[in-house]
């Protein structure tokens, strides 16, 4: 809601409106960039990121990236605009309330990424297949 006394600005992506001209509140996301992680072989992990930031642009969503190579495991937590690729991948699940990790093909490492659009949703990253909506049994539960 921009009240009438708030000036409008042209081509400004700090303000996101719906079709009725309402203003979108920004997302709150864990935002620690890249940190070493002990998350491995678990159904889900907490980010252990103590920084919750206000995303700069209201269209941004929360993102988490888990990477494992021969040397270490890292977890990246950020805000990102789902209209733009991240690490060369489209954020397909940006509207999800939960951060469900999906594996992406990256040479030389194991690479999982998730995105979501509820406050601090990238604090809890989920690897378990139970949460994957491509699972037909889960779809049955959802649509019953």
């Amino acid at each position: 809601t921009i009240p009438p006394h708030v000036q409008k600005s042209v081509n400004n992506d700090m303000i996101v409106t719906d079709n009725n001209g309402a203003v979108k509140f920004p997302q709150l996301c864990k935002f620690c960039d890249v940190r070493f992680s002990t998350c491995d072989n678990q159904k889900s992990c907490m980010s252990n990121c103590s920084i919750t930031s206000i995303c700069e642009k209201p269209q941004e969503v929360c993102v988490a990236v888990w990477r494992k190579n021969d040397e270490n495991i890292t977890l990246e937590t950020v805000c990102h605009d789902p209209k733009l690729p991240y690490h060369d991948f489209i954020l397909e699940d940006a509207a999800s309330p939960k951060c469900i990790m999906k594996e992406k093909k990256k040479p030389g490492e194991t690479f999982f990424m998730c995105s979501c659009s509820s406050d601090e949703c990238n604090d809890n990253i989920i690897f378990s297949e139970e949460y994957n909506t491509s699972n037909p049994d889960l779809l049955l539960v959802i649509f019953q």
Partner: nanobody, 124 residues
Framework: EVQLLESGGGLVQPGGSLRLSCAAS???????RMWWVRQAPGKGLEWVS?????????YYANSVKGRFTISRDNSKNTLYLQMNSLRAEDTAVYYC?????????????????WGQGTLVTVSS
């Protein structure tokens, strides 16, 4: 109907401090996450800081972290923003706004959700 009224703006030199207040009339102040939002001349809205109604957990934009402190006094229905180490780029009209649980959008022109704003000018 809750009305929001900001005060405390003014002219301050770079490096100086100001404390903004936002007084909310009405009895529902404690149900809302409260925000400070600013708009620099010719620019869009920037969401500066937020505070939860219970537990008073706080959030900040990267541009103000370590310089600004948000707080609230639920007994006085008042929101505050302590601004230290002010810079020229902090010059803006500062608004307070409220957000209900799970609310993602706010309708344009809802003055029960937005204050009228207070101007902060940082200049030598």
């Amino acid at each position: 109907e809750v009305q929001l009224l900001e005060s405390g703006g003014g002219l301050v030199q770079p490096g100086g401090s100001l404390r903004l207040s936002c007084a909310a009339s009405g009895s529902t102040f404690t149900e809302y996450r409260m925000w400070w939002v600013r708009q620099a001349p010719g620019k869009g809205l920037e969401w500066v800081s937020a505070i939860e109604p219970i537990g008073h957990r706080t959030y900040y934009a990267n541009s103000v972290k370590g310089r600004f402190t948000i707080s609230r006094d639920n007994s006085k229905n008042t929101l505050y923003l302590q601004m230290n180490s002010l810079r020229a780029e902090d010059t803006a009209v500062y608004y307070c706004a409220k957000q209900a649980p799970n609310q993602r959008y706010v309708a344009r022109g809802r003055l029960d959700y937005w204050g009228q704003g207070t101007l902060v000018t940082v200049s030598s």
